[in-house]
Interface confidence: medium
Amino acid sequence: QRLSRAQQQLPLESLGWDIAELQLNHTGPQQDPRLYWQGGPALGRSFLRGPELDKGQLRIRRDGIYMVHIQVTLAICSSTSTSRHHHPTTLAVGICSPASRSISLLRLSFHQGCTIASQRLTPLARGDTLCTNLTGTLLPSRNTDETFFGVQWVRP
Amino acid sequence: QRLSRAQQQLPLESLGWDIAELQLNHTGPQQDPRLYWQGGPALGRSFLRGPELDKGQLRIRRDGIYMVHIQVTLAICSSTSTSRHHHPTTLAVGICSPASRSISLLRLSFHQGCTIASQRLTPLARGDTLCTNLTGTLLPSRNTDETFFGVQWVRP
Amino acid sequence: QRLSRAQQQLPLESLGWDIAELQLNHTGPQQDPRLYWQGGPALGRSFLRGPELDKGQLRIRRDGIYMVHIQVTLAICSSTSTSRHHHPTTLAVGICSPASRSISLLRLSFHQGCTIASQRLTPLARGDTLCTNLTGTLLPSRNTDETFFGVQWVRP
């Protein structure tokens, strides 16, 4: 897919430097499995440059292929607390709106670990809102070096 | 944050192609939890293009947002060796100097696993030195496909 | 390593936008530990833009440093099914051809987990074919949000 002449001549940032790294704000109310995120220099090392937050969920503002990454660490966790004696704890990242584009992008279970971390490349479109759903009874750590979620635009 | 006209007109490399992928050299002496890294084509597939090594620790030479990634595999490891019967083994990546910018960027515990792997986006500044601290009694594998640490500049 | 004047003046895509994200197609026959991949918009969110598939294995078409990432989730898996009572299940990503460049790039064992995920930076050359070998008796999930493999060109 070739870049148009206009794209070639625009400053580099116009090709898309969209990037965000978020820290956990809070979990949702009882029946809401979503994690709610926050970002900005005032909060520490999190930031939003292009994407935006809509009620704690990340909204994409530029079409393209993105690298999506996440790490979630469970608080007050030991290998036994995530083992088969409990309802399995699972983390799923997906497009939750618009509804017509709803899909799970990345899913991991904790099994006998207390941290999951992964990343993937995926096409995203302007207006896609990403939700991170944590199912199970265990709570995530809010430490900024243990739980974070980010996206990086990598190409049109 | 817009790129200056000067930045727009410089060759692309001047916007920052800084990148490094390191392999484990050795662990520190008894009371030093840091891992010591090495890099360069003569060693195999590791390299430094921009960042530099200072006594086995990675020093940043260009301001920007970086993707930091790491994988560490424990040697002579089984699920039991990393379980609750042992002092927990934890890996933390952080800025260790200058002292004024000291902070933990990324932290993972091994629990019942023998490998941790993660990545995150974080702003780094020229002169920041990244340290990777492995606490606990288990040793890391020096296999170059099992233990590695890298950074990639992704935007100003 | 400075970019040549020709490189500086070419449209950005000519510097290398090569990128791919693949989903699992199938496992190999009995004695073949390789995973076979597929990609393309008709299949969902997987794609190939530059690299190509050769009998289910990913072939690189442009020299450069790449970020290679993978997530593999085992199907019908519990912590006990990956524990020490079984032959260890291991995933290795490597260059499998040409033979002269054969090397393991990234290796992880499942231990008591059911998912592995990691990423690394590595130099790859035109013609390198990447193979992903899953050893052990457990089968991978073909869910596209649980098992995927991708590469992204990041610099010359």
Epitope: - | R45, A75, C77, L139, S141, T144, D145 | -
Partner: antibody, heavy 122, light 111 residues
Framework: EVQLVESGGGLVQPGGSLRLSCAAS????????MNWVRQAPGKGLEWVSD????????YYADSVKGRFTISRDNSKNSLYLQMNSLRAEDTAVYYC???????????????WGQGTLVTVSS | QAVVTQEPSLTVSPGGTVTLTCGLK?????????PTWYQQTPGQAPRLLIY???TRHSGVPDRFSGSILGNKAALTITGAQADDEAEYFC??????????FGGGTQLTVLG
């Protein structure tokens, strides 16, 4: 089945040179660290040298440092030991040994060749 | 002078139990030395038996076991058999990246 076959041993005068080879088969050679271990006649084992899976990092016992060079060719599944400035005390059976990969801080040799005898004598 | 010490020779009766030890000239052996044991029969290459103090290598019979006894690493053979007659070497991790081997213990199975 893992197989390691050493060759290149023989009689050499003090100060001379010899190159040992080890042909590996039955496993993915490029994944493993490889080692040379020697055993003087009637004596114990002595670790000599190791090389990482890519061939870029090498370590040597103090007794051979500066005289011996370990190398490998992954495309040929082969390990080598170039021995220069040989001394009488280098007389030994030289074994090629695969590191199990459990740790490369702690060499653990899970597969050995049958050895090749090097005799340094005038 | 050897840094790693072993009994030069030991004898056991068929079906009996014998313990071989591996010590340090100065200091105690701990699991941080990652004791490893090898068996060598005459004219053969060494064979890995035990690593990481007490982990049996694949294919090694369970009559072989490893442990730390007091300030030494130990290899215990229970129900000794005639083909256990061999020389046994221990190896300890002392300084990165090398291992030090002991002088070996010649085990004789009487009978």
């Amino acid at each position: 089945e893992v197989q390691l076959v050493e060759s290149g041993g023989g009689l050499v005068q003090p100060g001379g040179s010899l190159r040992l080879s080890c042909a590996a088969s039955g496993f993915t050679f490029s994944v493993y660290y490889m080692n040379w271990v020697r055993q003087a006649p009637g004596k114990g084992l002595e670790w000599v040298s190791d090389i990482n899976n890519e061939g870029g990092t090498t370590y040597y016992a103090d007794s051979v440092k500066g005289r011996f060079t370990i190398s490998r060719d992954n495309s040929k599944n082969s390990l080598y030991l170039q021995m220069n400035s040989l001394r009488a005390e280098d007389t030994a059976v030289y074994y090629c040994a695969r590191d199990a990969g459990y740790s490369n801080h702690v060499p653990i040799f899970d597969s050995w060749g049958q050895g090749t005898l090097v005799t340094v004598s005038s | 002078q050897a840094v790693v010490t072993q009994e030069p020779s030991l004898t056991v009766s068929p079906g009996g139990t014998v313990t071989l030890t591996c010590g340090l000239k100065s200091g105690s052996v701990t699991s941080d030395n990652f004791p490893t044991w090898y068996q060598q029969t005459p004219g053969q290459a060494p064979r890995l038996l035990i690593y990481n103090t007490n982990t049996r290598h694949s294919g090694v019979p369970d009559r072989f076991s490893g442990s730390i006894l007091g300030n030494k690493a130990a290899l215990t053979i229970t129900g000794a058999q005639a083909d256990d007659e061999a020389e046994y070497f221990c190896a300890l991790f002392i300084s990165n990246p090398s291992v030090e081997f002991g002088g070996g213990t010649q085990l004789t199975v009487l009978g």
